[in-house]
């Protein structure tokens, strides 16, 4: 009997998938509802707990009881503040366990309490069991995919989750990079490309620029929001349609959590609507106080409404390029994953940002995932299908890895972007005549001083005989593995005595919204990124006008105050330069300036004209922060010239 | 009927300055933007800029940035370029433009000669 | 920075026949939202200044003789003089106004 097949999860925040490699294809395997998707909820009742999408169906109907998101919970503790901002939006409860957050529901009559681990395995299960119900035996190897930005705590707390489901997890990998694989896989042209993968999904945005060369896969770099998706354009919805049913009916259901449960699964099903065609109608029967709710929304007010949503996918496009040192000109292909990037108005900022590329839509979004993590459970496996057999993965540190050497300083062994699995060692020395031994703190960040960046363990290395300063050699070695798990050890040259540590899941890793946020502090002490962030600025600044002059000659208390041809000049030259704006979002500071004051001189004489006595509105400042204080512990350690 | 009137020619000697005016007339000074464009002898035309003449802000090419300068007096419905440092690569005749959809008004352009 | 690059550097046109003249851009100067190419062309008389004849790669100025004509779009573009006329005699020359400002070489049409 032929070896039982690994399969590849794509574990989503919103949605998950399942595939397999066999007879030298994938297959993405349909659930029992005839879905090649399947919901990320689990839902307990007085009777029972449903997974997928059974869970999702009766949300509206149990609420408190049914839950999503895990994802966004997985691998933190209770009091991060993605924690604390995202228990604000969901109807269920997550309580604090020891700084670590748990899900409260009423199950079969009792409060149960699980960790997000626990949620999670549930819908690995059933991802499981969709494979088995497939392919007819048990499974237990799989591959699982995370966010790119996922850190340790994420990982080793999602490896956990497959372990509690029963799986064998073969490796995390992450989600671009798996789709970078299945993209791999449709290729057969030689030479090196370049391609960017666009990975707007449910819950979570990623944006990553791999090198494909005959079958070998090299993560450039990776950037992205974990808070951005699917699930922001629905809110987006259902806030305009909260108050256009406070407009016509003068109620306000937002506090009803049942009417707007039923009015985002509406919102949800127009928003898919709206990616084929150009107007999607509602219909809701009884949504609040026994008034039926018909109505419509454009495809235009929709990408009004999520406008800024939409350009800010461009940020990090922007971000991957620079990390990445090329410049849009040398992508070779743009790969759409996500069932977001089926939206029409993602797709033509992607599409206008590179200059009207084509973008590659082969790959169904919603499995690419699931797709390339199937692959990779196939090589793992041992698979020796032509397909296979030659494609190597090389994934990427998000940021850099190093230690405190003498003054506070950051020395870095392992620079952020640098492909992984990787190896690096250095000799240090002692920094005081008959130093005993020596403390290794463990930092990643990318700030000149320890003291900025983030602590990740430390340990000792102790015994070292007594001798001059500098004369000890101290080799010290920083191994990432594959999974991302970090080994760093300490060995005392002359005596061979050596001391390690593994960075896990307990060291309190940082999050994404904490990474970038040590990314762009770095960058802002670097003077050529100073350059950046003026351009960003005064993109700021331009766009910022033209939606604020835009809406306030659109303001129908301005109807008889402002002539016809004056709106239309001022709505023509807005036009122009959000469409431009859309187009140039790379575009170079002198560029937004121009445009902007362009655009003030259509506008202000106009503007003024209306508030006589008050100055023509202009955009607003930018704050800046200055370096963070604090100060540094002795020096224990010295980098060797 | 508009009207952009620009100052009389000018020869000056190297590392000196030069103001050049451009009044303009018939139309709301404030409603519309003023482009400044040089033209060296028997050469084609180079935009150097502009100024937004309701803010005050102006906007400089990448060649001249550094010793232009662009400022108006809107009291006078007046705009000026002023040009400091004058090498001999600075002679040229320098127009000013209003500017609204394109550069549909000009003045009758300056000679500024350098010449040691 | 768009460049502007007009072929021929000068031309020699009959009375009465056509002249055209080529603007090739650097990038593409077409805005998706208004779909109007950002690109005008002005005439500059001997010892005179510069004229304004078309923007928006097809749009007349006013006053301006139908003869003129301008057409294109995204990065090539043409000025066309249906029935050149001895005042017609001048550089031509075309700008861009897609991002910042930047005039082509100028083209010089003389009769033959």
């Known amino acids: 009997m032929a070896k039982a097949a690994a399969i590849g999860i794509d574990l989503g925040t919103t949605y998950s998938c399942v595939g397999v490699f066999q007879h030298g294809k994938v297959e993405i395997i349909a659930n029992d509802q005839g879905n090649r998707t399947t919901p990320s909820y689990v839902a307990f009742t007085d009777t029972e707990r449903l997974i997928g999408d059974a869970a999702k169906n009766q949300v509206a109907l149990n609420p408190q009881n049914t839950v999503f998101d895990a994802k966004r919970l997985i691998g933190r503790k209770f009091g991060d503040p993605v924690v604390q901002s995202d228990m604000k939006h969901w109807p269920f409860q997550v309580i604090n366990d020891g700084d670590k957050p748990k899900v409260q529901v009423s199950y079969k009559g009792e409060t149960k309490a699980f960790y997000p681990e626990e949620i999670s395995s549930m819908v690995l299960t059933k991802m499981k069991e969709i494979a088995e119900a497939y392919l007819g035996y048990p499974v237990t190897n799989a591959v699982i995919t995370v966010p790119a930005y996922f850190n340790d705590s994420q990982r080793q707390a999602t490896k956990d989750a497959g372990v509690i489901a029963g799986l064998n997890v073969l490796r995390i990998i992450n989600e671009p990079t798996a789709a970078a694989i299945a993209y791999g896989l449709d290729r057969t042209g030689k030479g090196e490309r370049n391609v960017l993968i666009f990975d707007l999904g449910g819950g979570t945005f990623d944006v990553s620029i791999l090198t494909i060369d005959d079958g070998i896969f090299e993560v450039k770099a990776t950037a992205g929001d974990t808070h951005l998706g699917g699930e922001d354009f629905d809110n987006r919805l259902v806030n305009h349609f909260v108050e256009e049913f406070k407009r016509k009916h003068k109620k306000d259901i937002s506090q009803n959590k049942r009417a707007v449960r039923r009015l985002r699964t509406a919102c949800e099903r127009a928003k898919r609507t709206l990616s084929s065609s150009t107007q999607a109608s509602l219909e809701i029967d009884s949504l609040f106080e026994g008034i039926d709710f018909y109505t419509s929304i454009t495809r235009a007010r929709f990408e009004e409404l999520c406008s800024d949503l939409f350009r800010s996918t461009l940020e990090p496009v922007e971000k991957a390029l620079r990390d990445a040192k090329l410049d849009k000109a040398q992508i070779h292909d743009l790969v759409l994953v996500g069932g977001s990037t089926r939206i029409p108005k993602v797709q033509k900022l992607l599409q206008d940002f590179f200059n009207g590329r084509d973008l590659n839509k082969s790959i169904n979004p919603d499995e690419a995932v699931a797709y390339g993590a199937a692959v990779q459970a196939a090589i793992l496996m041992g698979d020796k299908s032509e397909n296979v057999q030659d494609l190597l993965l090389l994934d990427v540190a998000p940021l850099s890895l190093g230690l405190e050497t003498a003054g506070g300083v950051m020395t870095a062994l392992i620079k952020r972007n640098s492909t992984i699995p990787t190896k690096q060692t250095q000799i240090f020395t002692t920094y005081s005549d008959n130093q005993p031994g020596v403390l290794i703190q463990v930092y990643e960040g990318e700030r000149a001083m320890t003291k900025d960046n983030n602590l990740l363990g430390r340990f000792e290395l102790s015994g070292i005989p007594p001798a001059p300063r500098g004369v000890p050699q101290i080799e010290v070695t920083f191994d990432i593995d594959a999974n991302g798990i970090l080994n760093v050890t300490a060995t005392d040259k002359s005596t061979g005595k050596a001391n390690k540590i593994t960075i896990t899941n307990d060291k309190g890793r940082l999050s994404k919204e904490e990474i970038e946020r040590m990314v762009q502090e770095a960058e802002k002490y670097k003077a050529e990124d100073e350059v950046q962030r003026e351009r960003v600025s005064a993109k700021n600044a331009l766009e910022s006008y033209a939606f604020n002059m835009k809406s306030a000659v659109e303001d129908e208390g301005l109807k008889g105050k402002i002539s016809e041809a004056d709106k239309k000049k001022v709505l023509d030259k807005c036009q122009e330069v959000i469409s431009w704006l859309d187009a140039n979002t790379l575009a170079e500071k002198d560029e937004f300036e121009h445009k902007r004051k362009e655009l003030e001189q259509v506008c202000n004489p106009i503007i003024s004209g209306l508030y006589q006595g008050a100055g023509g509105p202009g955009p607003g400042g930018f704050g800046a922060q200055g370096p963070k204080g604090g100060s540094g512990s002795g020096p224990t350690i010295e980098e060797v010239d | 009927q508009i009207q952009l009137v620009q100052s009389g020619a000018e020869v000056k000697k190297p590392g000196a300055s030069v103001k050049v005016s451009c009044k303009a007339s018939g139309y709301t000074f404030t409603n519309y933007g003023m482009n400044w464009v040089r033209q060296a002898p028997g050469q084609g035309l180079e935009w150097m800029g502009w100024?937004?003449?309701?803010?005050?802000?102006?906007t400089y090419a990448d060649d001249f940035k550094g010793r232009f300068t662009f400022t108006t007096d809107t009291s006078t419905s007046t705009a000026y370029m002023d040009l400091r440092s004058l090498r001999s690569d600075d002679t040229a005749v320098y127009f000013c433009?209003?500017?609204?959809?394109?550069?549909?008004?000009w003045g009758q352009g300056t000679l500024v000669t350098v010449s040691s | 920075e768009i460049v502007l690059t007009q072929s021929p550097d000068s031309l020699s046109v009959s009375l009465g026949e056509r002249a055209t003249i080529n603007c090739k851009s650097s990038q593409s100067l077409l805005n998706s939202g208004t779909r109007k190419n950002y690109l005008a062309w002005y005439q500059q008389k001997a010892g005179q200044s510069p004229n304004l004849l078309i923007y928006?790669?097809?749009t007349r100025e006013s006053g301006v003789p139908d003869r003129f004509s301008g057409s294109g779009s995204g990065t090539d573009f043409t000025l066309s003089i249906d029935s050149l006329q001895a005042e017609d005699v001048a550089v031509y020359y075309c700008?861009?106004?897609?991002?910042?400002?930047?005039f082509g070489g100028g083209t010089k049409v003389e009769i033959k």
């Open positions: 928006w790669t097809s």
């Open positions: 100024i937004n003449t309701y803010t005050g802000e102006p």
């Open positions: 433009a209003r500017y609204d959809h394109a550069m549909d008004y």
């Open positions: 700008k861009q106004s897609y991002t910042l400002y930047t």
